[in-house]
Structures are given as structure tokens and as C-alpha cells.
């Protein structure tokens, strides 16, 4: 083996496991790794006595290398005093040698926790004439502490006796303030407490806040629509700003990820709006399993007469799943409008608020311009709710008496999409040779007298169909009950509205 | 995983100045989740010492070494993902490899190797 230097380490007990009434205490010095022997270990014990003991040296099994203890013990005053630990290794070099220098134990600390806090304004959001800021120095093993106050990194005079230490448990916490006068805080100065513990320094910095978005000009950054996400497999996001002067100068918007990965190509439209603003959005084509899998996208947007950049940021939102229940229906006839229905599609209990409805007449998805549909809002409960509104001809309804409301959310299952059926003539389905055979189970009102159906929306049901109990494999609400079908025969006629 | 990668190491003159950058990527890296970015740096023959701190969501909590204090300033771009190490008034004892690393779940800028998770390969510092 070839000539290696050791490496060495101190040795040293926990100072919480050495009983305060000890006399003498020992501490070591480990060198190992070195080739070949001998090494010599001293010790510089100050004004204190000591005896040394230096182990015979081991060979390290893989290396064939050698390792060495020396062991030293002090009695007396011991407790504050520092001991260096000198190993010399001639065969590395005449001159080669490591010192340590060390105390008796080692005290495992935890460090400070810096944090300013700042005065409030008043009620109108103005300063007061003075601004107080507390510097919390929390969450440390006890320990000598220094606290400094900085004005853009020059040390202030400060009266720091005003400090208050308090101790819980085994971690002190200090806190020191000080007061600045209005005009120093608006002077757009940066403060420093600075913290020195354990050969370190800690620090945390505040200054008056700009404000939070240049006045005037907004910036927006949406999601990905689910249709999008997961029907057209395709998502963009868009970054839209809005209420920019027309001005010389280009608004730059510049995509990335939080992940530091590339961003895809994105598309740019600038519209001059009638007020005389300028609108700029910029569409980003994102990845579905990257944004399913939580990336985040930030916007930034530029401008030489903006003060600061806008920066935006989206992800996939977090916390609970819910899937969406869909009911639809259909409005009865109004006196004066036979030739136009509306039918309306409650959506409901879903999370998050992320959702995309569509409706579908033939088996064809009708454009998004048909229907109108509410923004998300809130339940009493935890979910979210939208309502979507589609006005049908009668040559729609007298072609396929059958349109479809359909919700595409993350937490729909099995495909993300959940749909309901409606009619507008729910008892005539249609004239068509399907309307002969309808489901054999359908809602019933919930309270409904058995034995006595109700007529819904001007049809009347088969006189043998009547409201029997809830079923457990019915797909609606555990308040409805079923209709269950009497007749008998091949080919019998059900009733395929409400009971 | 968290990856990270230093740069802006180089040769200079005592007294002169070098920026360091380094950048974090990866899957579970988001400026937003409790990160705590350090530099250390580690001589010849030496043990790998702290250098300095910072924290991902505040920005203004740092941590320094007393050996830097005043000379060196750590800071960091939420935009681009990356923690800088500004060092003025370079002395030769500053001459080591420069380590970038990560840790996550502390209240404070933590200090000790140990409490650093992931690391960078490092880049070296000359100081002639």
C-alpha cells in the first residue's frame, strides 16, 4: 500500500451525559486511515494536568490501513477549557500534522429562528409617525446570543438592553425591537437583525413593501380546462394582462417551470381594447402528465414602464376530490313559445371547481355558444355548484328527443365524465320505434304515497307503474324512490318521466 | 429527487470578486415547499465547512460562517430556480470546492452538513 496520511476526529462525550459532579473526564483523539505506522499524538492541556493513553494501533480490514486512539484525562477545572489533540505522521512528510482543538463535550444545539415583525398601519392603510419593528429570535438551545441591527448593511446605533430572554422548555427565545421614524421607513431603506450564535450568523431583513402590482395593470394565469386536459388530451394554459397603456415598448411574456425543465412554444394575441387599453395573452400548450402530476407554470411579464415584473404562477390544485352529481331537466311548455324549450343541467358537490360541461344533442356535441353556464360557486357544504342553461327547436326535439348534459371533471370515474339524459316530452319519447322501450326503473319523488303516481310535466304515467321503495342499484340520490314497471306481457310500456 | 447544479467558479486575484449560481430542478423542487439552500465549501485536506444559508420561501433568513461575514451574500430567483453565492474581497483561504445543497423541514437556516439532503458536485474556487 501506498503512503497515506490519517484522518482525524475528536472525541467527545455528550455534556448532557457527564454528571455535574464529576471530577475527571476523559476525551480522545481518533486517527485512522494512515499508512504506514507510527503515528505520534500530544496533547496541549493548557495550565490543566492530565494523563495520556495512546491504544495500540488496528489494521483496517479492506484498506490494510492503520487506526489509532489516544485517550486523555483531565480533572479539575475542566469544564470551560479547551484542549488541542497534535498528530504528526512523518512518514507522510516530516512536517505533516493535524491539530483539533476541542472542549471536553459537545453540546448538540439547535440554532435560532429569525423573524422581523412589523407594526401595522392604521385603518386607512396609512404609516403611523413611528414604525416599530420586532426582531423574534426564536427556537435555540440556550446559549450566548448577540443581536445587531443593520440600515442597508451599516451597523445602528442601538439600545439593546430593551432584549427580553425567555426560556420553554429546553429552547430560549429573545426579542429585541426598534423604532423608526416614518420618514426613515419610507425611505425605501433595508433593515437587518442579525443574530451571532455558535461562531454563526443569522439574520432576517425587511423594508417597506412596493406596491404589491404596478397600479393599474393586472395579470392573470387560468388552468387548463378538464375538456381540454382530458377529452382533447391537449391542455393550454393562458396568461392574460390587461389594462396596459398602448405605449412604445414591447410587453414580454416569458413562460417556465418550476422544475427547471423546457417549456413547449407558446402563442401570442395582442387586442387594442374599445376603452383604449391594450390586452395581451399568451397560450402555453402544457403537458397532461406533467400537469397531473403537479408541475407548476409561471408568467412572467415585463415592460420598460412597469417598476417591477408581474410574475404569476398555476398548478394543479391540491386537497380534496369529489366527483360531480348531474341532474337534468326539462322546462314544461310556455304559453306563446311552443316551438323553444329550455333545458337546465344543475351540477353539483364536485372538487375542486375545475369543470367543463358540455351538452349533446345526436350524439354531437353542440357549440359551446348554445349553452350558457354559471361560474362555480360554493355549497353550504364543501363542494362546488354550476348550473348550465341550453335553449332547443322544436326540429331538434322532433328529430332525437334525447340531449345530454355532460360534466368533465378530475374526479369522475371511470373516464372523468359524468352525464345525464334529458327529454323535453319525457312520456313521448320521440315517436321513435325506442320510445316502445324505455328503462324499467325510474325516480320517483321522494314522500310519494305508494300506489299513486304523479303526473310530471304535462305526460301522464302508465296507470300500472307505481312508486315502490329506493333501490340500492338506482344510480340517483338515496332520496328518491324507484318506479317500478307492473305490466306484463313481450313487450311492455313503461313510464319514463317522473313519477 | 432534487438536482442541483453549481457553476461560476473560476481562478481570481485576492481582493477580487466571483459569483457562484446554482440551480435546482427536479420532480418534488418547488420554490414553495419549505426548501433550505446552503453553500459549503471544502479545502484541500480540510473538512467541508458551512459557508452560508438561506431560506426558499422568505428569501431575507440567511445564515453565515463568521468567516465571511461582511464579504459574502447569499441570495436567490424564485423565477429561475437558482440560489447565488456572491463573494467579495476573496482571500486565499477562500480557495475550496464550492458545494451547493439542500435541506427541507427545519424553521431555521440550518448550518451542519448533515442536515443537508441532497448535494451538488461542487465547483472550485481558486483564490491566487
Known amino acids: 500500500a501506498s503512503t497515506q496520511s490519517p484522518s482525524v476526529f475528536p472525541l467527545t462525550r455528550c455534556c448532557k451525559n457527564i454528571p455535574s459532579n464529576a471530577t475527571s473526564v476523559t476525551l480522545g483523539c481518533l486517527a485512522t486511515g494512515y499508512f504506514p505506522e507510527p503515528v505520534m499524538v500530544t496533547w496541549d492541556t493548557g495550565s490543566l494536568n492530565g494523563t495520556t493513553m495512546t491504544l495500540p494501533a488496528t489494521t483496517l480490514t479492506l484498506s490494510g490501513h492503520y487506526a489509532t486512539i489516544s485517550l486523555l484525562t483531565v480533572s479539575g477545572a475542566w469544564a470551560k477549557q479547551m484542549f488541542t489533540c497534535r498528530v504528526a505522521h512523518t512518514p507522510s512528510s516530516t512536517d505533516w500534522v493535524d491539530n483539533k482543538t476541542f472542549s471536553v463535550c459537545s453540546r448538540d444545539f439547535t440554532p435560532p429562528t429569525v423573524k422581523i415583525l412589523q407594526s401595522s398601519c392604521d385603518g386607512g392603510g396609512h404609516f403611523p409617525p413611528t414604525i416599530q419593528l420586532l426582531c423574534l429570535v426564536s427556537g435555540y438551545t440556550p446559549g450566548t446570543i448577540n443581536i445587531t441591527w443593520l440600515e442597508d448593511g451599516q451597523v445602528m446605533d442601538v439600545d439593546l438592553s430593551t432584549a427580553s430572554t425567555t426560556q420553554e422548555g429546553e429552547l430560549a427565545s429573545t426579542q429585541s425591537e426598534l423604532t423608526l421614524s416614518q420618514k426613515h421607513w419610507l425611505s425605501d431603506r433595508t433593515y437587518t437583525c442579525q443574530v451571532t450564535y455558535q461562531g454563526h450568523t443569522f439574520e432576517d431583513s425587511t423594508k417597506k413593501c412596493a406596491d404589491s402590482n404596478p397600479r393599474g395593470v393586472s395579470a392573470y394565469l387560468s388552468r387548463p380546462s378538464p375538456f381540454d386536459l382530458f377529452i382533447r388530451k391537449s391542455p393550454t394554459i393562458t396568461c392574460l394582462v390587461v389594462d396596459l397603456a398602448p405605449s412604445k415598448g414591447t410587453v414580454n411574456l416569458t413562460w417556465s417551470r418550476a422544475s427547471g425543465k423546457p417549456v413547449n412554444h407558446s402563442t401570442r394575441k395582442e387586442e387594442k381594447q374599445r376603452n383604449g387599453t391594450l390586452t395581451v395573452t399568451s397560450t402555453l400548450p402544457v403537458g397532461t402528465r406533467d400537469w397531473i402530476e403537479g408541475e407548476t407554470y409561471q408568467c412572467r411579464v415585463t415592460h420598460p414602464h412597469l417598476p417591477r415584473a408581474l410574475m404569476r404562477s398555476t398548478t394543479k390544485t391540491s386537497g380534496p376530490r369529489a366527483a360531480p352529481e348531474v341532474y337534468a331537466f326539462a322546462t314544461p311548455e310556455w304559453p306563446g313559445s311552443r316551438d323553444k324549450r329550455t333545458l337546465a343541467c344543475l351540477i353539483q358537490n364536485f372538487m375542486p371547481e375545475d369543470i367543463s360541461v358540455q351538452w349533446l344533442h345526436n350524439e354531437v356535441q353542440l357549440p359551446d355558444a348554445r349553452h350558457s353556464t354559471t361560474q362555480p360557486r360554493k355549497t353550504k357544504g364543501s363542494g362546488f355548484f354550476v348550473f348550465s342553461r341550453l335553449e332547443v327547436t322544436r326540429a331538434e326535439w322532433e328529430q332525437k328527443d334525447e340531449f345530454i348534459c355532460r360534466a368533465v371533471h378530475e374526479a369522475a370515474s371511470p373516464s372523468q365524465t359524468v352525464q345525464r339524459a334529458v327529454s323535453v316530452n319525457p312520456g313521448l319519447a320521440g315517436g321513435s320505434a325506442q320510445s316502445q322501450r324505455a328503462p324499467d326503473r325510474v325516480l320517483c319523488h321522494s314522500g310519494q304515497q305508494q300506489g299513486l303516481p304523479r303526473a310530471a310535466g304535462g305526460s301522464v304515467p302508465h296507470p300500472r307503474c307505481h312508486c315502490g321503495a329506493g333501490r340500492a342499484d338506482w344510480p340517483g340520490p338515496p332520496e328518491l324512490d324507484v318506479c317500478v314497471e307492473e305490466a306484463e306481457g313481450e313487450a311492455p310500456w313503461t313510464w319514463t318521466g317522473l313519477c | 429527487d432534487v438536482q442541483l447544479q453549481e457553476s461560476g467558479g473560476g481562478l481570481v486575484q485576492a481582493g477580487g470578486s466571483l459569483r457562484l449560481s446554482c440551480l435546482a430542478s427536479?420532480?418534488?423542487?418547488?420554490?414553495?415547499?419549505?426548501?433550505?439552500m446552503g453553500w459549503f465549501r471544502q479545502a484541500p485536506g480540510k473538512e467541508r465547512e458551512f459557508v452560508a444559508g438561506i431560506k426558499w420561501v422568505s428569501g431575507s433568513n440567511r445564515a453565515y460562517a463568521e468567516s465571511v461575514k461582511g464579504r459574502f451574500t447569499i441570495s436567490r430567483d424564485n423565477a429561475k430556480n437558482t440560489v447565488y453565492l456572491q463573494m467579495n474581497s476573496l482571500k486565499p483561504e477562500d480557495t475550496a470546492v464550492y458545494y451547493c445543497a439542500a435541506a427541507t423541514g427545519q424553521s431555521y437556516v440550518p448550518i451542519r452538513e448533515y442536515e443537508y439532503v441532497y448535494w451538488g458536485q461542487g465547483t472550485q474556487v481558486t483564490v491566487s
Open positions: 427536479g420532480r418534488t423542487f418547488t420554490t414553495t415547499s419549505g426548501y433550505n
